[in-house]
Interface confidence: low
């Protein structure tokens, strides 16, 4: 077994039923909707090495995408604020000290946003942080992607796929040093083409919890340890994006 356990280092996840999180889903057992006992990169005997999955998108691209994430910065470079509409919020962001006030929410201005959209998370993510994304799935949608990014790494890739070999599936993964790791797949699929949705991501000490339309969907164990450096959320895919924001709960 690997000799690092974030769960051991950061045990306990606070209030199991926090305000703002779906009430009936706040106290799931470890691995609910996800992968009980999921381990960390490199811990899977006989696992194909990251990047070795047949049909995988080229390095630097998101799985299932035709190419690289549009507008993605070169490694090690954080982009300056975009000049177009629907870009970074002009005010209301907490400072990049890593401390979030207990009030909020902070995030995108109201109204339609241009996709792909980058939501800055200036202090990184911290336990009890709740990210909420509202939008509508486009008709005949193929994919949605949320990418919690740490520089050029993708700490958490949440990727609903509407037609993968005629099946609907949600794929979660992590990309480190341009290599994708072991996919975690979820067959429960709460998205519908042409319909509105609400995605909520709750950061816990040892995992991300994801709820869609107020129902708990899955959780994903942290593979990237430095949560405070996960400083951007990329939102892409076949959606009309209404809002993206975060608050502490």
């Amino acid at each position: 077994a690997d000799n690092f356990s974030l769960h051991d280092a950061l045990s306990g996840s606070g209030n199991p039923n926090p305000q703002g999180w779906p009430g009936a889903w706040g106290n799931q057992p470890a691995g609910a909707g996800g992968y009980p006992g999921a381990s960390y990169p490199g811990a899977y005997p006989g696992q194909a090495p990251p990047g070795a999955y047949p049909g995988q998108a080229p390095p630097g691209a998101y799985p299932g995408a035709p190419g690289a994430y549009p507008g993605a910065p070169a490694p090690g470079v954080y982009p300056g604020p975009p000049s177009g509409p629907g870009a970074y919020p002009s005010s209301g962001q907490p400072s990049a000290t890593g401390a979030y006030p207990a009030t909020g929410p902070y995030g995108a201005p109201a109204g339609p946003l241009i996709v792909p959209y980058n939501l800055p998370l200036p202090g990184g993510v911290v336990p009890r942080m709740l990210i909420t994304i509202l939008g509508t799935v486009k008709p005949n949608a193929n994919r949605i992607a949320l990418d919690f990014q740490r520089g050029n790494d993708v700490a958490f890739h949440f990727n609903p796929r509407f037609n993968e070999n005629n099946r609907r599936v949600i794929v979660c993964n992590t990309k480190l040093d341009n290599n994708w790791g072991r996919e975690e797949r979820q067959s429960v699929f709460p998205f519908e083409s042409g319909k509105p949705f609400k995605i909520q991501v709750l950061v816990e000490p040892d995992h991300f919890k994801v709820a869609v339309n107020d129902a708990h969907l899955l959780q994903y164990n942290h593979r990237v340890k430095k949560l405070n450096e996960i400083s951007k959320l990329g939102i892409s895919g076949d959606i009309d994006l209404t809002s993206a924001s975060y608050t502490m709960i």
């Epitope: 520089g151 341009n178 450096e229």
Partner: antibody
Framework: EVQLVESGGSLVKPGGSLRLSCAAS????????MNWVRQAPGKGLEWISN????????YYADFVKGRFTISRDNAKNSLYLQMNSLRAEDTAVYYC??????????WGRGTLVTVSS | QSVLTQPASVSGSPGQSITISCAGT?????????VAWYQQHPGKAPKLMIY???YRPSGVSNRFSGSKSGNTASLTISGLQAEDEADYYC??????????FGGGTKLEIK
Amino acid sequence: EVQLVESGGSLVKPGGSLRLSCAASGFTFSNYNMNWVRQAPGKGLEWISNIDGSSRYIYYADFVKGRFTISRDNAKNSLYLQMNSLRAEDTAVYYCVRSYYGGMDVWGRGTLVTVSS
Amino acid sequence: QSVLTQPASVSGSPGQSITISCAGTSSDVGGYYNVAWYQQHPGKAPKLMIYYDSYRPSGVSNRFSGSKSGNTASLTISGLQAEDEADYYCSSSTGYSTRVFGGGTKLEIK
């Protein structure tokens, strides 16, 4: 079997040029970042350069910038290092290495480059 | 001169544990990315032993463990065996693909 095999090392005069090649097999070459690392006789390891799978992102150590050029041909499963303006201090075994989660997990056996008049 | 500082040599007896340190700065070891450790026997290519600070590739003995605190990374080898005698190098990312190595540590088994 995952394998990297370097070639092209030889004796060259100061100021001369050399092109190293690395043949990759046993894995999907285009999916991986690749590196060149060198080791002078009796000395430690020195990272030289890195190239991503699509040749979009390329990085060099300061001591080779402007003199060495890394490239790859995914169709041929090959990595290259073009070395110009060679100096005596470039004498070393040059390794072709695959990136893996911030480490480097597959190494070739190396090819010796000797720069001497 | 190496950017990362390692002791030139360490020694231990079979069955003992030893720790090799790798001191850097907030721009490398203590910064954004991660540390890897390599073992190199004379005349051989290096072998990856630890990556992403503390993970072992498959096939590497669990006697090898990695950790990081602040600007210093450490490799610990427990239950020393004769075949552990080798040179050990730490490496850190300084950006997203750029890397630096330590000067290496020679491990002697008494």
